[in-house]
């Protein structure tokens, strides 16, 4: 892609580069305890870690961003680790008519890349 | 969206929060001077700036990421400023058979959000 090839091996050491990590959170943590009923505890996969040069680049823009960050670090930020895809979850809500199941398509990350 | 409402006014002051900024780069900067013929100078729109709580949240995931970053800053990173859309650009390439025009759909950012 654009004569720059993204790489998948982390040069910073294991677990340091952009990856998916599970964070446990309660509805209280999220401020949702008054309107989501269940489950009260969620396993939230999130994208964490650094984005060294060419690591898991999302696209051409990310590749040139990495390059320009090397040249102008004060002006151009390094790419950062964000979700590339999501996995849906279902939550039980209190509604006017009782309880309903609602799907969230963009709550839990499924994959990560550097953008 | 999920009872947390993203906001569009920057609490850090003008120009500090996630926004689109134009960066001028030469083909030499990008390492493309051997295979891209024209233009020699590119205006590259990139996403820069901070993502304070709820600012331009991309989706539900970004909203909860901001919330959890407030509770566990060492574990959960703050959302970061990345492209929400791109604008295509055309570059003139040197090819085996001469010169061709190639469109890049993901080279120049058109909008930014916090993800």
């Amino acid at each position: 892609s654009a004569h720059l090839h993204p790489r998948d091996s982390c040069p910073l050491g294991p677990g340091r580069c952009c990856h998916l990590e599970t964070v446990q959170a309660t509805l209280e943590d999220l401020g949702w305890s008054d309107w989501v009923l269940s489950p009260r505890q969620l396993q939230l996969s999130m994208c964490v870690g650094e984005c060294p040069h060419l690591y898991r680049s999302a696209n051409t823009h990310a590749l040139i961003k990495a390059r320009l960050h090397g040249l102008q670090p004060d002006r151009v930020p390094a790419p950062c680790c964000v979700p590339s895809s999501y996995t849906p979850v279902v939550l039980m809500h209190r509604t006017d008519s009782g309880v309903s199941l609602q799907t969230y398509d963009d709550l839990v990350a499924q994959g990560c890349h550097c953008a | 969206s999920a009872h947390l409402h993203p906001r569009d006014s920057c609490p850090l002051g003008p120009g500090r929060c996630c926004h689109l900024e134009t960066v001028q780069a030469t083909l030499e900067d990008l390492g493309w001077s051997d295979w891209v013929l024209s233009p020699r100078q590119l205006q590259l729109s990139m996403c820069v700036g901070e993502c304070p709580h709820l600012y331009r949240s991309a989706n539900t995931h970004a909203l909860i990421k901001a919330r959890l970053h407030g509770l566990q800053p060492d574990r959960v990173p703050a959302p970061c400023c990345v492209p929400s859309s791109y604008t295509p650009v055309v570059l003139m390439h040197r090819t085996d058979s001469g010169v061709s025009l190639q469109t890049y759909d993901d080279l120049v950012a058109q909008g930014c959000h916090c993800a």
């Epitope: 009923l37 269940s38 489950p39 009260r40 505890q41 969620l42 396993q43 996995t87 849906p88 979850v89 279902v90 939550l91 039980m92 209190r94 009782g98 309880v99 309903s100 199941l101 799907t103 839990v108 | -």
Partner: antibody
Framework: QVQLVQSGAEVKKPGASVKVSCKAS????????INWVRQAPGQGLEWMGW????????NYAQKLQGRVTMTTDTSTSTAYMELRSLRSDDTAVYYC????????????WGQGTMVTVSS | DIQMTQSPSSVSASVGDRVTITCRAS??????LAWYQQKPGKAPKLLIY???SLQSGVPSRFSGSGSGTDFTLTISSLQPEDFATYYC?????????FGGGTKVEIK
């Protein structure tokens, strides 16, 4: 490990009521809901309703509305299902089951309680 | 209410056979479908959730696929302990509903 343990078998007369208990262990009881599902002899599974252990909010199957009540006691991590005005076609094995979780999974089931309705 | 239609209602198969069971929802249920195995006198056991995710501890010969209205449970190589009744279940909306079941019998 996560477990749901139900009360023992019951024999009831038509018109009577039955109350089945389901004691949870191995997880935070208030983090999940409890479903009640029944299975008549030789038949398939029929969902009766759901209760959140946290707040007591319920959702009952329409055909049982008015005859069924589901409750929880958080101090003992126990869920209860009471069925009133019993009829012979209420004869079934009654199961409690934890869920749905965030992936709509009903993952842990009790061993079942046989309720026989006979005159 | 969402109706869940399972087919076939029974299947005769031999050890080592590949067995496929289908489940159709009367309306779209996204990927909110689960598969259960039940043996006589026992409670149902969760095999697959979210249409294709294998429950922890379940052998990898079980797999699920599909989304929307059409779903499949596949047992790649039937083992003696797999002879049982299988149910699909939707949890896209209340009331939660089950399919009628598929009995996998020894040929």
């Amino acid at each position: 490990q996560v477990q749901l343990v139900q009360s023992g078998a019951e024999v009831k007369k038509p018109g009577a009521s039955v109350k089945v208990s389901c004691k949870a262990s191995g997880y935070t009881f208030t983090s999940y809901g409890i479903n009640w599902v029944r299975q008549a002899p030789g038949q398939g599974l029929e969902w009766m309703g759901w209760i959140t252990a946290y707040s007591g909010d319920t959702n009952y199957a329409q055909k049982l509305q008015g005859r069924v009540t589901m409750t929880t006691d958080t101090s003992t991590s126990t869920a209860y299902m009471e069925l009133r005005s019993l009829r012979s076609d209420d004869t079934a094995v009654y199961y409690c089951a934890r869920g749905p979780g965030q992936y709509a999974d009903v993952d842990v089931w009790g061993q079942g309680t046989m309720v026989t309705v006979s005159s | 209410d969402i109706q869940m239609t399972q087919s076939p209602s029974s299947v005769s198969a031999s050890v080592g056979d590949r067995v496929t069971i289908t489940c159709r929802a009367s309306q779209g249920i996204s990927s909110w479908l689960a598969w259960y195995q039940q043996k006589p006198g026992k409670a149902p056991k969760l095999l697959i959730y979210a249409a294709s995710s294998l429950q922890s501890g379940v052998p990898s010969r079980f797999s699920g696929s599909g989304s929307g209205t059409d779903f499949t449970l596949t047992i790649s190589s039937l083992q003696p302990e797999d002879f049982a009744t299988y149910y699909c279940q939707q949890a896209n909306s209340f009331p939660i509903t089950f399919g009628g079941g598929t009995k996998v019998e020894i040929k």
